[in-house]
């Protein structure tokens, strides 16, 4: 369960890949598209509002008999729109929604090497936001074998 309904903190940051490509958002035909692209030097990076929530993970689910806490995030590039996991399509989409947000909008935050982070689907453990063919997609990762998967590493910069 997510502790309380308010985030413990929020920050505005631009999101880029391990290879320094920018994640950008464009309004097309009344819906938002998500792109992964090299930005021209003078172009301003899109900002995303990251809301951080603390989630209690009961020992019955944790597998090691100990209650634990996880840090979950929601990502909103523009008012009332949130990134959501579409597990059926293995895609990442922007949807307009009202609070309380659906579980598909929550991602478990992982600290990774090189001060990067990864976003794991709350609704589908082992599945992460990643980059595929210059788009964001959901990528299944064997956590023990695929630690360095660069396509699921992201940088946050304020």
């Amino acid at each position: 369960s997510i502790t309380g309904i308010s985030p413990i903190t929020e920050s505005l940051a631009s999101l880029s890949t391990y290879n320094d490509q920018s994640i950008t958002f464009a309004l097309e035909d009344e819906s938002y598209e998500i792109y992964v692209e090299d930005l021209k030097k003078d172009k301003k990076k899109d900002k995303v509002l990251l809301s951080y929530y603390e989630s209690q993970h009961p020992s019955s689910e944790s597998g090691d008999g100990v209650d634990g806490k996880m840090l979950m995030v929601t990502l909103s590039p523009t008012k009332d729109f949130w990134l959501q996991a579409n597990n059926k399509e293995h895609s990442v989409e922007l949807h307009k929604c009202e609070k309380p947000l659906p579980d598909q909008a929550f991602f478990v935050l992982h600290n990774r090497s090189f001060n990067c982070v990864s976003f794991e689907c709350k609704t589908d453990p082992g599945v992460f936001i990643g980059v595929k063919d210059n788009h964001l997609a959901l990528i299944k990762v064997d956590y023990s074998e695929n630690l360095g998967s660069e396509n699921i590493l992201f940088k946050l910069s304020e």
Epitope: V66, M70, L71, L109
Partner: antibody
């Protein structure tokens, strides 16, 4: 319950290497990062490095060339190895666990009791 | 690396008073700051995380505030066990640096 316990050699000769083992219980190394911190007697705290849940490592920039951190998940052990010790490496060495699964943002709730390492001829 | 400047290095106070310690980060760290206290010969204890969140079991007379680069830590109604050392630590990016510490004296 969650426990971390360091075991070290106590005394190390200058220019030799240091190996400390952190035995952990009550949690899984595949879910939590373990960090090493040291404290020179009467001084402040120095963060040395981390072995993250995913297996990647991070190190103190000034000590990176002399440090390595590894683990044996089957034995629930994390290891700190430090080469070419000097007298100013004399300190209490702590292993600590992340507050959050997979993330260091929440600081460190659980600390070992520390092991004193003296570097002296 | 992010430098953490903690002040004062030492402070005198009396039982029942309030004290404030500050920590400045050399670059923005969002809210990713923790405060610890350490009794002599003991391991540090987490008091505050995410700049303002009280760790489990920590009395409400401890509080934290700030974000970005400037942070404060306050103890109200000082008790005898509070006259020890305190440290801030940034957890925004590795290496996770500590402030130099503050010794609270009676």
């Amino acid at each position: 319950q969650v426990q971390l316990k360091e075991s070290g050699p106590g005394l190390v000769a200058p220019s030799h290497s240091l190996s400390i083992t952190c035995n952990v219980s009550g949690f899984s190394l595949s879910k939590y990062g373990v960090h090493w911190i040291r404290q020179i007697p009467g001084r402040g705290l120095d963060w040395l490095g981390v072995l993250r849940a995913g297996g990647s490592t991070g190190y103190n920039s000034a000590l990176m060339s002399r440090l390595s951190i590894s683990k044996d998940s089957s034995k629930s052990q994390v290891f700190l190895k430090m080469n070419d010790l000097r007298t100013d490496d004399t300190a209490v060495y702590f292993c600590v666990r992340d507050h959050y699964y997979y993330s260091s943002y929440g600081g460190f709730v659980y600390w070992g009791q520390g092991t004193l390492v003296t570097v002296s001829a | 690396d992010i430098q953490m400047t903690q002040s004062p290095a030492s402070q005198s106070a009396s039982l029942g008073e309030s004290v404030t310690i500050t920590c400045l980060a050399s670059q923005t760290i969002g809210a990713w700051l923790a405060w610890y206290r350490q009794q002599p010969g003991k391991s540090p204890q987490l008091l505050i995380y995410a700049a303002t969140r009280l760790a489990d079991g920590v009395p409400s007379r401890f509080s934290g505030s700030g974000s970005g680069t400037e942070f404060s830590f306050k103890i109200n109604n000082l008790q005898a066990e509070d006259f020890v050392s305190y440290y801030c630590q940034q957890l925004d990016s590795s290496p996770y640096t500590f402030g130099g510490g503050t010794r609270l004296e009676m």
